[in-house]
């Protein structure tokens, strides 16, 4: 079993609406048909799972209905979008890819994407 390389951008700035997108690309060592993608967040010496999806190659990623993540896949690339972000959600977002089927199982973990989120300034009150 060999390590699987996973690449992702070093830094992403979330939009003013709290949306951040990045590509997670993995070097598949075999012809996987079932892939699991997990987004982890590391901040303040704690790692938490943000979202996860299992998909069949050639099909769309399906996250849970209440997930803050959406995504699409194309070959060995996964385009991930995280929404509803606020300044307190700034942190390192790590892409974890597992090739579930067929065996053998492969695992790859990216170096992480630092996502910066800046809360928009509230509109000043106006007399007009």
């Amino acid at each position: 079993c060999k390590a699987m390389h996973v690449a992702q951008p070093a830094v992403v700035l979330a939009s003013s609406r709290g949306i951040a997108s990045f590509v997670c690309e993995y070097a598949s060592p075999g012809k996987a048909t079932e892939v699991r993608v997990t987004v982890l967040r590391q901040a303040d010496s704690q790692v938490t799972e943000v979202c996860a999806a299992t998909y069949m190659m050639g099909n769309e990623l399906t996250f849970l209905d209440d997930s803050i993540c959406t995504g699409t896949s194309s070959g060995n690339q996964v385009n991930l979008t995280i929404q509803g972000l606020r300044a307190m959600d700034t942190g390192l977002y790590i892409c974890k890819v597992e090739l579930m089927y067929p065996p053998p199982y492969y695992l790859g973990i990216g170096n992480g994407t630092q996502i910066y989120v800046i809360d928009p300034e509230p509109c000043p009150d106006s007399d007009f």
């Epitope: 079993c1 060999k2 996973v6 010496s45 790692v47 199982y105």
Partner: nanobody, 130 residues
Framework: EVQLVESGGGLVQPGGSLRLSCAAS????????LGWFRQAPGKGREAVST???????SYADSVKGRFTISRDNAKNTLYLQMNSLRPEDTAVYYC????????????????????????WGQGTLVTVSS
């Protein structure tokens, strides 16, 4: 297929010592992280110590100075020498492999660090009691 098999657990009195071993096979990572985790009854899994492919080691604050991690590359075996054992060290101890050494050194003092590891042994029980 990756296989990790731990051994060396048992019952020991407070202040005693144990040496855990983990025999690894089936992986060919050139750069990786090997770690020891533990899970006490009713608690989550926590990283105890890690060692990367360069031999750099890291320890949880609770075991620093008492536990020593090492590896024998020729035998593909990971070790954890545990001295001055305390009742709070009672747990099932697991060895694990992580594919990205970037997260190795910080794992022992990071909650949820098990997310960075993907291959696990079956565990060996360590009980510290008089």
């Amino acid at each position: 297929e990756v296989q990790l098999v731990e051994s060396g657990g048992g019952l020991v009195q407070p202040g005693g010592s144990l040496r855990l071993s983990c025999a690894a096979s089936g992986y060919t990572y050139s750069r990786h992280c090997l770690g020891w985790f533990r899970q006490a009854p009713g608690k989550g899994r926590e990283a105890v110590s890690t060692i990367d492919s360069d031999g750099s080691t890291s320890y949880a604050d609770s075991v620093k100075g008492r536990f020593t991690i090492s590896r024998d590359n020729a035998k593909n075996t990971l070790y954890l020498q545990m001295n001055s054992l305390r009742p709070e060290d009672t747990a099932v101890y697991y060895c694990a492999i992580g594919p990205n050494p970037r997260y190795c050194s910080g794992a022992p003092n990071t909650r949820g660090a098990e997310h960075y590891f993907g291959y696990w042994g079956q565990g060996t029980l360590v009980t510290v009691s008089s």
